[in-house]
Interface confidence: low
């Protein structure tokens, strides 16, 4: 399982997903933001 | 202005220690995870140690070949990050860049300072 | 660890031309790969994260796909200024990995 802190925050933060190019607020985790160092 | 300003490299010998620090500007630091990095001379990137924001407790991990050496800290009041590096070898010769990260969700933000030089010889 | 290998290891292209670089992961990453483009003297600039979402201001003619262990950047078509090298990199599980680079060279 991916354990990091990227992945984390994806869990629990809520982050807004990208769907057809319409933000939505879904609560869904995404991989929009794979960690940059 | 962005900025991200490593300090603190130089010539130490082996077994003996230094604080790296990295002052940022331009950003709201306390938001950003931020994660030190490593370039030995002609070699390839090596992740070294990361600290998550304050939100996040600021909780830390490190690379193997650090860990129980090397630590990693944060005082968001100066928007400064460290590295304190004891027992040094000259395998942690390199140059030391911090690097910082932040996800909004739609998009992230990712910054890097210039590095710093750090040389392990005696 | 997960082990990040790239290929080939140096690519010797001419300006205009495709460049195509890959990267290879030990485990599956999901798509928690970036991409960095890095310039001698200088600091690694990040070119793509999430596997293929493009950072803020990098060109068009940067892409990058895959999903799972194996993963793609691609440059469409080569501008001078591209000549560097570029390490590839995994955020699924600590520690965070490089691939070891491919040095993306004039011909």
């Known amino acids: 399982a991916c354990d990091t802190a990227t992945c984390v925050t994806h869990r629990l933060a809520g982050l807004l997903s990208r769907s057809g190019g319409v933000v939505k607020n879904n609560f869904v985790p995404t991989n929009v933001g794979s960690k940059a160092f | 202005e962005v900025q991200l300003v490593e300090s603190g490299g130089g010539l130490v010998q082996p077994g003996g220690s230094l604080r790296l620090s990295c002052a940022a500007s331009?950003?709201?630091?306390?938001?950003?995870?931020i994660s030190w990095v490593r370039q030995a001379p002609g070699k390839g990137l090596e992740w070294v140690a990361e600290?998550?924001?304050?939100?996040?407790?600021?909780?830390?991990h490190y690379a193997e070949a650090v860990k129980g050496r090397f630590t990693i800290s944060r005082d968001n009041a100066k928007n400064s990050l460290y590295l304190q590096m004891n027992s040094l070898r000259a395998e942690d010769t390199a140059v030391y860049y911090c690097?910082?990260?932040?996800?909004?969700?739609?998009?992230?933000?990712?910054?890097w300072g210039q590095g710093t030089l750090v040389t392990v010889s005696s | 660890e997960i082990v990040l290998t790239q290929s080939p290891a140096t690519l010797s292209l001419s300006p205009g031309e495709r460049a195509t670089l890959s990267c290879k992961a030990s485990?599956?990453?999901?798509?928690?790969v970036s991409w960095y483009q890095q310039k001698p003297g200088q600091a690694p600039r990040l070119l793509i994260y999430?596997?293929?979402n493009r950072y803020l201001g990098i060109p068009a003619r940067f892409s990058g796909s895959g999903s799972g262990t194996d993963f793609t950047l691609t440059i469409s078509s080569l501008e001078p200024e591209d000549f560097a090298v570029y390490y590839c990199s995994q955020s699924y599980n600590y520690p965070y990995t490089f691939g070891q680079g491919t040095k993306l060279e004039i011909k």
């Open positions: 331009g950003f709201t630091f306390s938001n950003y995870w």
């Open positions: 999430g596997a293929s």
């Open positions: 600290i998550r924001s304050e939100s996040d407790a600021s909780a830390t």
């Open positions: 690097s910082s990260y932040f996800d909004y969700g739609l998009a992230i933000q990712n910054y």
């Open positions: 485990k599956r990453v999901t798509t928690y």
